[in-house]
């Protein structure tokens, strides 16, 4: 995500429009406590990070409260007073939505409607993945709102479901992150189950963004 400057690689994650995490990997400075300085306005003085992430006892990132912030993060990673990486980035391009909340299942014969609370901002896709013990891989369906109906299910089979949220690529670009998955929920004959008996540990989901 970050071009290298003096061998510094950066990663930015904007958690649900609330918190920004900037991490760095700087092999040249692996035993050095680099400092992180930032501002949200191009004309303000830099503030220093107050919430560092540590790796093997050295600074490796910063967590910033970015609620009510709506645009560009200007930042500088420094070795003492010497900047080793300076950049500005529109934060929205690194959005990671929060995991779906209040996931509910409504069954009607061979179909289920999966709903959850829509996030407060738009241009998102709500993806449901599901499989039965007889499926070799996860099936997927997504909608613009958290109201996804899956038809053609076999009422006698047990199905595992989980849900996540993704930012639409044509709006937010290719560098966003899907949310974490919701917990796996298992259903059979319209009733919740502890697990689908024949299913071992669920396989890795498809990594489609």
């Amino acid at each position: 995500q970050g071009g290298a400057a003096e061998g510094v690689q950066i990663q930015i994650i904007y958690f649900n429009l609330e918190t920004v995490q900037v991490t760095w990997n700087a092999s040249k400075y692996s035993r050095t406590n680099l400092t992180f300085h930032y501002r949200f306005n191009g004309d303000e003085a830099y503030d220093q990070c107050t919430n560092y992430l540590l790796q093997e006892g050295h600074t490796s990132g910063c967590l910033l409260d970015a609620e009510q912030r709506d645009d560009i993060l200007y930042f500088s990673i420094r070795n003492g007073t010497h900047p080793v990486f300076t950049a500005s980035r529109w934060m929205v391009y690194y959005l990671k939505p929060s995991s779906p909340k209040h996931v509910r299942f409504s069954w009607h014969q061979d179909a289920v409607t999966v709903t959850c609370s829509d996030l407060s901002y738009g241009d998102l896709l709500y993806e449901v993945q599901y499989r039965s013990p007889f499926d070799t891989e996860w099936q997927s369906k997504q909608e613009n709102t958290c109201n996804v109906t899956i038809e053609g299910l076999d009422a006698e089979k047990c199905y595992s479901f989980w849900v996540r949220v993704k930012a639409m690529e044509d709006v937010y670009g290719p560098d966003t992150y899907p949310s974490d998955w919701s917990e796996v929920t298992c259903w059979q004959r319209g009733e919740i189950r502890d697990a689908c008996a024949e299913t071992p540990t669920p396989p890795k989901p498809k990594l489609s963004k």
Epitope: A5, L17, D70, S88, R89, W90, V92, Y93, G122, P174
Partner: antibody, heavy 125, light 106 residues
Framework: QVQLVQSGSELKKPGASVKVSCKAS????????ISWVRQAPGQGLEWMGW????????RYAQGFTGRFVFSLDTSVSTAYLQISSLKAEDTAVYYC??????????????????WGQGTLVTVSS | DIQMTQSPSSLSASVGDRVTITCRAS??????LAWYQQKPGKAPKLLIY???TRGSGVPSRFSGSGSGTDFTLTISSLQPEDFATYYC????????FGQGTKLEIK
């Protein structure tokens, strides 16, 4: 359809002030941010900053703080650019441009699909 | 700032020609690049965003490519209405534009 209509050309003396307006129609004004872009005669395009039409929060690019003020009147779906203490080097066409894709609840992202027709501000004694 | 450098600064071509304009960013901007067309006395018009996605109503003869620091805008077969100035713009950081490429009739 989306339209941004700007106020007419202005001729001002050095030291004076000017206020350029940008009236939006064809969409919900508070849903998308408005940027201001400057183009000096025969020159390229320069982003001046943007204003969040939902919160009213202005953000100024480096070099456009102090004499430049972005404001809004959401009741008439209009954004304003005011420049005070005008100098000869402020002579330029000023454009308003609407954020293309990202809604104000999220912020902005610097892509401009819709533009006003431009307002020429000439500063001369 | 991220500097955007366009080349050439001007070029002459004929109707029907294939034309390529290049844009180089001073640092990696991934695919966060737009191309605009501007005619004299008019506002810029968005042609391409995400380096290769055509804007609404933009003819298919316009195409964009590139990623990282090097980008191109190609007009496959020039039409009379295509003679204008073209600007690239990065939106990875706060927006900056290239200096423009003036496309003139030969």
């Amino acid at each position: 359809q989306v339209q941004l209509v700007q106020s007419g050309s202005e001729l001002k003396k050095p030291g004076a002030s000017v206020k350029v307006s940008c009236k939006a129609s064809g969409y919900t004004f508070t849903s998308y941010g408005i940027s201001w872009v400057r183009q000096a005669p025969g020159q390229g395009l320069e982003w001046m900053g943007w204003v969040n039409t939902n919160t009213g929060n202005p953000r100024y690019a480096q070099g456009f703080t102090g004499r430049f003020v972005f404001s809004l009147d959401t009741s008439v779906s209009t954004a304003y650019l005011q420049i005070s203490s005008l100098k000869a080097e402020d002579t330029a066409v000023y454009y308003c441009a609407r954020e293309g894709f990202i809604r104000t609840v999220v912020g902005a992202a610097g892509r401009f699909v819709y533009w006003g027709q431009g307002t020429l501000v000439t500063v001369s004694s | 700032d991220i500097q955007m450098t366009q080349s050439p600064s001007s070029l002459s071509a004929s109707v029907g020609d294939r034309v390529t304009i290049t844009c180089r960013a001073s640092q990696d901007i991934h695919t966060r690049l737009a191309w605009y067309q501007q005619k004299p006395g008019k506002a810029p018009k968005l042609l391409i965003y995400w380096a290769s996605t055509r804007g609404s109503g933009v003819p298919s003869r316009f195409s964009g490519s590139g990623s990282g620091t090097d980008f191109t805008l190609t007009i496959s077969s020039l039409q009379p209405e295509d003679f204008a100035t073209y600007y690239c713009q990065q939106y990875s950081a706060y927006p900056t534009f290239g200096q423009g490429t003036k496309l003139e009739i030969k």
